[in-house]
Every structure is written in C-alpha cells, then in structure tokens.
Interface confidence: low
C-alpha cells in the first residue's frame, strides 16, 4: 500500500503519500477551531507509470496509453485512497463542541 | 456534474471530462480484442481551484491550502468519478468470447 509505512521510509518519485502539516489559522485562515492548532493532513503526489498502484481498469488503460503516447496529456493522477477523520474542539459562544470532521487525513494513495 | 452533458458543451479549463478515443491496437498494443476496434474511454483533466467539485473534506482543505500557499506542490487532482463497463468480443482459439470489462469508460470527474 502507498501509505506512511512504505512512502515515508522510501525515496519514491512515483505516486506516494507525502507528509503535509496544516496549521488551521496560518494555512487555511480558519480561526474557529480551538484544538488542535493543526494536523498531519498529508497529500498524494508523484508519477503514475504503467501498473503503479492503478485503481481501475481505466487508469491501467490510461497509463499504458500514456506509455505508448508519451506526448499525450491524458494520464492517471495520484490521489487519496484511504482517509481518516479528525476530531476537533471548537466553541459556539462559550459552549465547547467536539466534532469529528470526516475524510480529513490521507492515509494512503492510488493512481486513478 | 462534471460529465459529458456539461463538459463537452463548455470550454472549461477547470477539472472536467475530456474526450479520448482509444484504438486498442494502435494505442495500447492489444491485438486480442476482436470487437470493438476501439472505444471512447474519455479522461479527466483540468485545474482544481477551491470548491470546484471537491470530492472530500481533505480535497477542500487541500485546495484552500493551495490558494493561500500558491507555491506549494500539494493540490487536489482531477480524476474519474463515475465509470462504466465496456463489452468486448475476443477469441480463444476459434471460440468467440464476450466479456464485460469493468470501469473502462469515464462518465464524470471530480477533484480528489
């Protein structure tokens, strides 16, 4: 799997999980989240050569097409596969609220 | 939806469905498929600015991050959303076989 266990321990130019820490205030302009101040969102990036973690038959076809037609702009893209939620604390007035924001953390990637 | 009905009728630089015809022999080197000779595979391409058909909370966060940090390499990517199968005819020896290849045709796109 193109997850932290593989990607963060290997130098990999192909599609892989990349570390990205996001500070809510500085990076998103979100001042309403009290805790945490930021989080390890991570992101997916890298090339999608033929058969590199292809998600669907179409992405396999597209990467093969791209191999045979390298000048073509049609190629698969490295995107998130498994995502996890993030629990946040915020306030409505003086009332603390705890909420789980779904699909906030990327755990693994795929070529799609 | 970023499908043919919208994308093929609008000049759109942002993420959208793009037409792509694939000839099995010429473009993929596949000689085993007897019919069809090729098909409209289509593909997804284009920019993913903030809130443009974001697939997940993470892709929304990432596009907002990218707006505030335009020099960053972390940004969402335009990929397939809905896919359809393609029915093919091929031969094993002299015996014709009909098979449905799943996820061969892209019908719509998303920013992920």
């Amino acid at each position: 799997a193109l997850d932290a266990a593989y990607c963060f321990r290997n130098v990999q130019d192909n599609c892989c999980l990349r570390p990205l820490y996001i500070d809510f205030k500085r990076d998103l302009g979100w001042k309403w989240i009290h805790e945490p101040k930021g989080y390890n969102a991570n992101f997916c990036a890298g090339a999608c050569p033929y058969l590199w973690s292809s998600d669907t038959q179409h992405s396999r076809v597209l990467s093969l097409y791209n191999t045979i037609n390298p000048e073509a702009s049609a190629s698969p893209c490295c995107v998130s596969q498994d995502l996890e939620p993030l629990t946040i604390l915020y306030y409505i007035g003086k009332t603390p609220k705890i909420e789980q924001l779904s699909n906030m953390i990327v755990k693994s990637c795929k070529c799609s | 939806a970023l499908d043919a009905a919208y994308c093929f009728r609008n000049v759109q630089d942002n993420c959208c469905l793009r037409p792509l015809y694939i000839d099995f022999k010429r473009d993929l080197g596949w000689k085993w498929i007897h019919e069809p000779k090729g098909y409209n595979a289509n593909f997804c391409a284009g920019a993913c600015p903030y809130l443009w058909s974001s697939d997940t909370q993470h892709s929304r966060v990432l596009s907002l991050y990218n707006t505030i940090n335009p020099e960053a390499s972390a940004s969402p990517c335009c990929v397939s959303q809905d896919l359809e199968p393609l029915t093919i005819l091929y031969y094993i020896g002299k015996t014709p076989k009909i098979e449905q290849l799943s996820n061969m045709i892209v019908k719509s796109c998303k920013c992920s």
Partner: antibody, heavy 118, light 108 residues
Amino acid sequence: QVQLVQSGAEVKKPGESLKISCKGSGYSFTRYYVAWVRQMPGKGLEWMGWIDPGQSNTRYSPSFQGQVTISADKSISTAYLQWSSLKASDTAMYYCARMLAWGWFDYWGQGTLVTVSS
Amino acid sequence: SYELTQPLSVSVALGQTARITCSGDNLGGYYAHWYQQKPGQAPVLVIYDKSDRPSGIPERFSGSNSGNTATLTISRAQAGDEADYYCASYDSSLMMVFGGGTKLTVLG
C-alpha cells in the same frame, strides 16, 4: 546513502549575525522536513523548529520564535539556521536532522559548534 | 507547553535489563521516539513510532508506550550501551519536544 553535512564551527562576537547550513544528499530533499536542534554545553537536546522544504512551511518552538530564522534552498538541497544578533547564551552545538512526518529524526548532521564570546 | 519527564540517571548491571521511562500528558496517544547520544557524537535514533527499530539497531532495544508513559527497554545491556538517552514526541501543533535525557550507566 543519506547524509546531512553541516557547515564548520563558528566563533562570533555578541551582536554579530550568523547563518549556518545543512546540506542533504542521497535522498529527495523536498520530501522530508528538516529540523534544527540545540544542545548547550553539558545540557540536553532542545528542538528549535522545522522546515518543510517542499512547501516552505516552518514551525518554531516558542522558545526560539523570533530569535532565529529557518529557511531552505531546495535547488541546492540546503537548509539554514540564522541569527541577526547573536548573544553569549547562543553558544551551543547545533544539529540539523531529517524529520519524518510524525516527528522522528532518522538522520542527523554532524553538528555545528557556535561560540559567541566577546 | 508540552513537557516530557525522564529520570536523570539509570544504572544497570552488565547483561541485565535496563528500563528508561518517559512521562508526559497522554503520551500514549502520540508517537514516542528514543535517541541515543554518546559523548562527542550526534544523536542516533534507536526507537521510533513507539516501538519500531531502525535498521542497524540491535533487537535488544525495544519500546512501548501507553497511558502517560513511554518506556525504552535495553535487554542484555553492554558496556557500549552507556550513553545519554532522550525520548521525544510532539504536541497537537507538531511542536516537537525532547525529554531532559537519562544517563545510562552499565555497571561491571
């Protein structure tokens, strides 16, 4: 093999400026954070801050915020730690380290000894 | 700010098992890492992600982390294990923090 090579020892006077460097090789420089760690004579390790060279994000320990500046030039795979006005209390060994996303430092530089004395 | 507390020193007889603790608020909910530093040398990562060992680190080194305490265990201690050991973790803002360090002495 992965290496972090730091610039040589420095002897400076209080009030002077200084920029020390840490050059990464043997890996994709923009794919890992670089952290700076201070160790004063006979004392423990103190995290100063980190930079993500790929995104140019930085984060500083509150103890070092405004005291130092961390930067990087990804074109030459080098991270920097700089002071605009040194103090005698800045005398220490400074280490750079390659940092993985969840906070561990898997490779370290050899250290740069900075001595500030009038 | 987040703090990690370690004993100043730990002694162990040659060939016996040494345990070095590191305590911090809800430390078990975070990643905990351990570094070994010998005099005049840069630190070396010996345990990361609570209990994983980098290549080249002997199996005698192991880690655990639960509740408010992370523990570095060195079994069959050798003279060459004498060093300062630092635990490290981070708070919710990815502010890194080191423990104060523990001097390990191997007796005999």
